[in-house]
């Protein structure tokens, strides 16, 4: 397991325990129980106090973060007494053997890469093991693919995100024979780690008058739809003089996604390219391949 | 131009079952998520189910659970709702509507509604 | 019962500034979820008027605006028309209830 847990509690204990796979917290249950009360307080003194059980003998926490180290605190009120019992969960190991610099990245839809760093004080032989569980706690995924630097693993690639929900659990564990590695754990949204893939189907067709852009949003791994997106079309002269300003026009997702405008014949070669982003977050994908339209007599 | 096009007006006796059709031009179905929404004057409007691409099924409100049946034959771009066991306060216009965002649910375009009487 | 709370009714005259309350709690827009907002004009269906607490859809003019605050949101008409008479809604989605809940409409007078 990857952390010690150290109870200070009174003398008839409540036996407070914590799985770390459910983030369940748990204790006996006390007979003539009035009140229940769990909690825990981080290192910034921030409290959590998740909903309690329907049994109220234990409550699950859910959107925590435990590798500052936490303590856990259990209120319990009897007809006859009151019991009250801590339960402190360290991050143990040495410090700075955690990994660092950790970030993970959603693409092409449906593949994802997490990268870290060793940390500064892990011993050579360190090594690295990603889990990830959602935020449904139904099943732990563990990392398929490793990404290398002399042995360690600094990196995971997967390729089936099927498991992962709206916001997920990681956890980086540490291994070493010399000493004690710390583990670090981070809550991330898929929504704010998803990186799309340019607008598809961009075409142009022009009449004597106007021209009219169409293109298709791009695939996700989030569940989105049409008014999420927001486009940037770059529509641009070509053989124009160094410095001159592109044509940057915003356009909101719609149904059908087009942007009509006026250009009128004979019109000199144009480029245009499309890129997306939620409309919430505006994480701007990489440029559409450039669609040229118009002639070089123009 | 994306329209939705949702079937005429019913006249059902109670227990009888209703079903209503609501066919997409302009679009593909199977590209959309189609809910529907129904409209009374004593309750207002009540989401009651469509389809969720996350659970890839269509999912019902808690509180039309058993009764309703929502399906879709894209072969056709129409989408169609089932109502059985009907009673007197299931009189309402029902909507549907294509989803413009899932989070939260957003009805980006509406039918023009059918207007669905119980009475014996 | 409506799941959100707005006013029945508020007027104004024409060119004037009107705006909609909508309360929630907790559980919906507080949760937070976003806000958006609905126009039905009488005997038709509801039209998307505001989405994502004060996105307008292509076609909604400028003079609609909405915002949103801890559990409550509001929406604004500016320079009051004929045409903006109508019955007004919010939606969310819920955690509890799951779905989307509405607001149960404010009827929209132009004096």
């Known amino acids: 397991e990857k952390s010690d847990l150290r109870t200070v509690a009174p003398a008839s204990s409540l036996n407070v325990r914590f799985d770390s796979r459910t983030m369940n917290l748990s204790w006996d249950c006390q007979e003539n129980t009035t009140f229940s009360k769990c909690f825990l307080t981080d290192k910034k003194n921030r409290v959590v106090e998740p909903r309690l059980s329907n049994n109220e003998c234990s409550c699950t926490f859910r959107e925590i973060c435990l590798h500052e180290g936490v303590t856990f605190e259990v209120h319990v009120n009897t007809s006859q007494r009151g019991f009250q019992q801590k339960l402190l969960y360290p991050n143990s190991g040495r410090e700075g053997t955690a990994a660092q610099n950790f970030s993970c990245f959603i693409y092409n839809a449906d593949l994802m890469n997490c990268t870290w760093a060793r940390g500064p004080t892990a011993p050579r032989d360190v090594q690295y093991f990603l889990y990830i569980r959602n935020s449904k706690r139904r099943r732990e995924i563990r990392c398929p693919y490793y990404i290398q630097d002399s042995g360690t693993h600094v990196g995971c690639h997967l390729d089936n995100l099927s498991g992962l929900t709206s916001r997920n659990y990681f956890l980086v564990n540490g291994t070493s024979r010399e000493i004690g590695i710390q583990f670090f754990d981070s809550l991330l949204d898929t929504k704010k780690i998803e990186r799309f893939n340019p607008p598809s189907n961009v075409t142009v067709r022009c009449n004597t008058t106007h021209c009219l852009v169409r293109w298709k949003q791009p695939r996700t791994y989030q569940k989105l739809s049409y008014l999420d997106f927001q486009y940037q079309l770059d529509v641009h002269r070509k053989n124009t003089q160094p410095g001159t300003e592109n044509l940057l026009i915003n356009v909101s997702g719609d149904l059908e996604n087009r942007y009509n405008f006026p250009s009128s014949e004979p019109r000199a070669k144009h480029s245009v390219k499309i890129r997306a982003a939620d409309v919430r977050i505006l994480n701007w994908s990489s440029w559409s391949e450039a669609i040229e339209f118009g002639s070089d007599d123009g | 131009q994306v329209q939705l096009v949702q079937s005429g007006a019913e006249v059902k006796k109670p227990g009888a079952s209703v079903k209503v059709s609501c066919k997409i031009s302009?679009?593909?179905?199977?590209?959309?998520?189609i809910h529907w929404v129904r409209q009374t004057p004593t309750k207002g409007f009540e989401w009651m189910g469509g389809f969720d691409p996350e659970e890839n099924e269509i999912v019902y409100a808690q509180r039309f659970q058993g009764r309703v049946t929502m399906t879709e034959d894209t072969s056709i771009d129409t989408a169609y709702l089932t109502l059985s066991s009907l009673r007197s306060d299931d009189t309402a216009v029902y909507y549907c509507s294509i989803v413009g965002s899932f989070s939260p649910l957003t009805m980006g375009l509406w039918g023009k509604g059918t207007m669905v009487t119980v009475s014996s | 019962q409506a799941v959100l709370t707005q006013p029945s009714s508020v007027s104004g005259a024409p060119g004037q500034r009107v705006t909609i309350s909508c309360t929630g709690s907790g559980s919906n827009i507080g949760a937070p979820y976003d806000v958006s907002w609905y126009q039905q004009l009488p005997g038709t269906a509801p039209k998307l008027l505001i989405y994502h607490n004060n996105k307008r859809p292509s076609g909604v003019p400028d003079r609609f605006s909405a915002s949103k605050s801890g559990t409550s949101a509001s929406l604004a008409i500016t320079g009051l028309q004929a045409e903006d008479e109508a019955d007004y809604y919010c939606a969310t989605s819920d955690e509890i209830l799951s779905g989307s809940v509405f607001g149960g409409g404010t009827k929209v007078t132009v004096l």
């Open positions: 302009g679009h593909s179905l199977s590209e959309l998520s």
